[in-house]
C-alpha cells in the first residue's frame, strides 16, 4: 500500500489521542534504554509503511501484536485516514483470525514495541525544512510543510 | 533517568567561532529529535535548530541557518552546535534539549547550558 | 513565522492567589482537534521546565496548582494558588508551524 494520501495530520491525531497510551501500557515495566532502535524512517509515508510492517506482519519470536490494543486502533486510523487501505487488508486481516489468539508478551515483541515508538515519534515530527531553504531531504513531506 | 550533559563556559573573540556539545544518556538516542535554544536576559528563549540523530537530518531557524551548524556523534551519543562569525548578540546561554517521546513538539529534558561570552 | 505575544510582560501577585498569564499566536496553532501550545517556567540560571503540553497536559511532576485552557490562537497558563516557589519567567512555544516559536515571557514576582 502507497501511504502517500493519507491524512497524516489526523493519524498522528488518533497517535497523540490513543494509540500511545496503549503502546505505553504494553512497555510498561521496561526500561527505555533496554532496547537498540535499528529501525528507521525517512518520511511521513515510509514511516507509515514501516509501521505497518512491525504492527502486523508477524516476526520470528513475535507473532502476536496485530492482536494488541494499539495495534486495531492504528489499524482503525489507517484504514480512515488512507484512501483504499481497507481494501488492500482484506487478505491480511483473514490471516491474522487464523493466528492463534493467546496473547504472549515475549522480549522481542518489547523490543518490536520499543522500535514502533521511535517510529511514531519520527512520523509525528519529521524535520522540515523551512520554505525558501534549497536542502530539502524529504521531499515525500513538502506538501505537509506547515501542519506536523 | 533522561539526562544531557553540556560542555562548559566559552569566552571567545568577535568574529571566531565556537563549538560545543551535549552528550545524552538514559534515552534512545538516535529516535530523538534533539533541539538548540539561546536564552538571553534581553530576547528571551530562540529556537535555534534541531537535528534527527537517526539521520542526521537538520532544520534550522532561517535567523541562524547561515551561522549554526548542528551535527552529531551517533557512537557517543553527542549533539555538536557551532556557532561562526561571532558577535556581542550571541553572548547568552545556548540550551540542548530533547523533543518528547511522542512527537508532541514540547522540551522535556534539558541540559544545563553553556555560557558563550562573546568579548575582545 | 508565528509571533506568540505574552501578557502582561510581568506581574505582581500576592501569595495564595490566582496569577492568569495570556499567551496569543498571530495565527492558530491547533491541527486536527490539537493545540500544539506548550508552556514552560524558567528560573534564573537553569533551563526551562515543561509546565504544561498540548494547552492543557500537566507535565511530569507538576503541581495540579497549574493548569492551561485555549485554542486556535488564545491561550492562558493560570497558577492557582501561587506560592513562594513560583517565581520565576513563564513562556509559551508553539510547534504547530515551523519555525519552532517562543513567546517573549512573563516575569512573576510576588507582592
Known amino acids: 500500500y502507497d501511504f502517500t494520501n493519507c491524512d497524516f495530520e489526523k493519524i498522528k491525531a488518533a497517535y497523540l489521542s490513543t494509540i500511545s497510551k496503549d503502546l505505553i501500557t504494553y512497555m510498561s515495566g521496561t526500561k527505555s534504554t533496554e532496547f537498540n532502535n535499528t529501525v528507521s524512517c525517512s518520511n511521513r509515508p515510509h514511516c507509515l509503511t514501516e509501521i505497518q510492517s512491525l504492527t502486523f506482519n508477524p516476526t520470528a519470536g513475535c507473532a502476536s501484536l496485530a492482536k494488541e490494543m494499539f495495534a486495531m486502533k492504528t489499524k482503525a486510523a489507517l484504514a480512515i485516514w488512507c484512501p483504499g487501505y481497507s481494501e488492500t487488508q482484506i487478505n491480511a486481516t483473514q490471516a491474522m483470525k487464523k493466528a492463534r489468539k493467546s496473547k504472549v508478551t515475549t522480549n522481542k515483541c518489547l523490543e518490536q514495541v520499543s522500535q514502533l515508538q521511535g517510529l511514531w515519534r519520527r512520523f509525528n515530527r519529521p524535520l522540515l525544512k523551512q520554505q525558501g531553504s534549497s536542502d530539502y531531504k524529504d521531499d515525500d513531506d513538502k506538501h505537509h510543510h506547515h501542519h506536523h | 533517568q533522561a539526562y544531557l550533559q553540556q560542555s562548559g563556559a566559552e569566552l571567545v573573540r568577535p568574529g571566531a567561532s565556537v563549538k560545543m556539545s551535549c552528550k545524552a544518556s538514559?534515552?534512545?538516542?538516535?529516535?530523538?529529535?534533539m533541539h538548540w535554544v539561546k536564552h538571553t536576559p534581553g530576547q528571551g528563549l530562540e529556537w535555534i535548530g534541531a537535528?534527527?540523530?537517526?539521520?542526521?537530518?537538520?532544520s534550522y531557524n532561517q535567523k541562524f541557518k547561515d551561522r549554526a551548524t548542528l551535527t552529531v556523534d551517533k557512537s557517543s551519543r553527542t549533539a555538536y552546535m557551532q556557532l561562526s562569525s561571532l558577535t556581542s548578540e550571541d553572548s547568552a546561554v545556548y540550551f540542548c534539549?530533547?523533543?518528547?517521546?511522542?512527537?508532541?513538539?514540547?522540551?522535556?529534558?534539558w541540559g544545563a547550558g553553556t555560557t558563550v561570552t562573546v568579548s575582545s | 513565522d508565528i509571533v506568540l505575544t505574552q501578557s502582561p510582560a510581568s506581574l505582581a501577585v500576592s501569595l495564595g492567589q490566582r496569577a492568569t498569564i495570556s499567551c496569543r499566536a498571530s495565527?492558530?496553532?491547533?491541527?486536527?482537534?490539537?493545540?500544539?501550545m506548550h508552556w514552560y517556567q524558567q528560573k534564573p540560571g537553569q533551563p526551562p521546565r515543561l509546565l504544561l503540553y498540548?494547552?492543557?497536559n500537566l507535565g511530569s511532576g507538576i503541581p495540579a496548582r497549574f493548569s492551561g485552557s485555549g485554542s486556535g490562537t488564545d491561550f492562558t497558563l493560570t497558577l492557582n494558588p501561587v506560592e513562594t516557589d513560583d517565581v520565576a519567567t513563564y513562556y509559551c512555544?508553539?510547534?504547530?508551524?515551523?519555525?519552532?516559536?517562543f513567546g517573549a515571557g512573563t516575569k512573576l514576582e510576588l507582592k
Open positions: 538514559g534515552f534512545a538516542f538516535t529516535t530523538y529529535n
Open positions: 512555544q508553539q510547534i504547530n508551524t515551523d519555525p519552532l516559536t
Open positions: 498540548r494547552a492543557s
Open positions: 537535528i534527527y540523530p537517526g539521520n542526521g537530518e537538520t
Open positions: 495565527e492558530s496553532v491547533d491541527n486536527s482537534g490539537l493545540s500544539f
Open positions: 534539549a530533547r523533543e518528547d517521546d511522542y512527537g508532541e513538539g514540547y522540551f522535556d529534558v
